[in-house]
Interface confidence: medium
């Protein structure tokens, strides 16, 4: 089946990097500076990817593949293939419309991409605020006042008015 | 081809004024919002500001709030950025920058990008 195809399609045998040239009687022509075949059998190249602005170069276009973009310090990929990069934020914050800007009371966002989340809320396993919460670090939950029985644990439990790590309903 | 074209850069004194361009071409232009960001001599690249495809909601980073305008004009396939009471600090090559479509998180990325336009702010 192969040998028949090729024998109608004189383009089936162009390989990856090159295209069926019509204007040069279906001949196989390389594939022009900046673009580029990834399968055989094309008629066209495609444009090589160029990353600019805020993309930088991953990987250099060639014959065979395109380029591949990563994104400049200070912003993260988004998207398929990196079609987009969004602005990094420190720790403790998260991207509004207005840029970055701290986590509110009882949230935290330790990365630097993301949004701020609520604090655990360790009372509804039955546990203590061992750790209180950041605006970098969630709460640390521990154990339940119950199981703190006197010389049980070295640790003692803060007992604060308000639960710190409770986050405002 | 999808192309962002900057113009409007220059030399200017402390407290003057200069009001950048950017050229849309090759897209939808009144389907994306749009973005100014800045890279200051050896430092990375700040967002600026931005603006809502219609027009209706623009954001600005705090250091340039109050100083800096966004416009866009959807006819013209084109956005602007005013920039009065210009600082040393606000040195730096200015590039425009397409932002998502449609109201979602993607508007804060940034996918085609001009070459930008330098600005220079020195006495």
């Known amino acids: 089946f192969e040998r028949t195809r090729s024998l109608q399609d004189p383009c089936s045998n162009c390989p990856a990097g090159t295209f069926c040239d019509n204007n040069r009687n279906q001949i196989c022509s390389p594939c022009p500076p900046n673009s580029f075949s990834s399968a055989g059998g094309q008629r066209t190249c495609d444009i090589c990817r160029q990353c600019k602005g805020v993309f930088r170069t991953r990987k250099e276009c060639s014959s065979t593949s395109n380029a591949e973009c990563d994104c400049t310090p200070g912003f993260h990929c988004l998207g398929a293939g990196c079609s987009m990069c969004e602005q990094d934020c420190k720790q403790g914050q998260e991207l509004t419309k207005k840029g970055c800007k701290d986590c509110c009371f009882g949230t935290f966002n330790d990365q630097k991409r993301g949004i701020c989340r609520p604090w655990t809320n360790c009372s509804l396993d039955g546990k203590s605020v061992l750790v209180n919460g950041t605006k970098e670090r969630d709460v640390v939950c521990g154990p339940s006042p119950a199981d703190l029985s006197p010389g049980a644990s070295s640790v003692t439990p803060p007992a604060p008015a308000r639960e710190p790590g409770h986050s405002p309903q | 081809e999808v192309q962002l074209v900057e113009s409007g850069g220059g030399l200017v004194q402390p407290g003057g004024s200069l009001r950048l361009s950017c050229a849309a071409s090759g897209f939808t232009f009144s389907d994306y919002w749009m973005n100014w960001a800045r890279q200051a001599p050896g430092k990375g690249l700040e967002w600026v500001a931005n603006?809502?495809?219609?027009?209706?909601?623009?954001y600005y980073v705090d250091s340039v709030e109050g100083r800096f305008t966004i416009s866009r004009d959807n006819a013209k396939n084109s956005t602007y950025l005013q920039m009065n009471s210009l600082r040393v600090e606000d040195t730096a090559v200015y590039y425009c920058?397409?932002?998502?479509?449609?109201?979602?998180?993607?508007?804060?990325?940034?996918?085609?990008w001009g070459q930008g336009t330098t600005v220079t702010v020195s006495s």
């Open positions: 920058a397409r932002g998502g479509a449609g109201y979602s998180m993607s508007h804060y990325g940034m996918d085609v």
């Open positions: 603006i809502k495809e219609d027009g209706s909601e623009k």
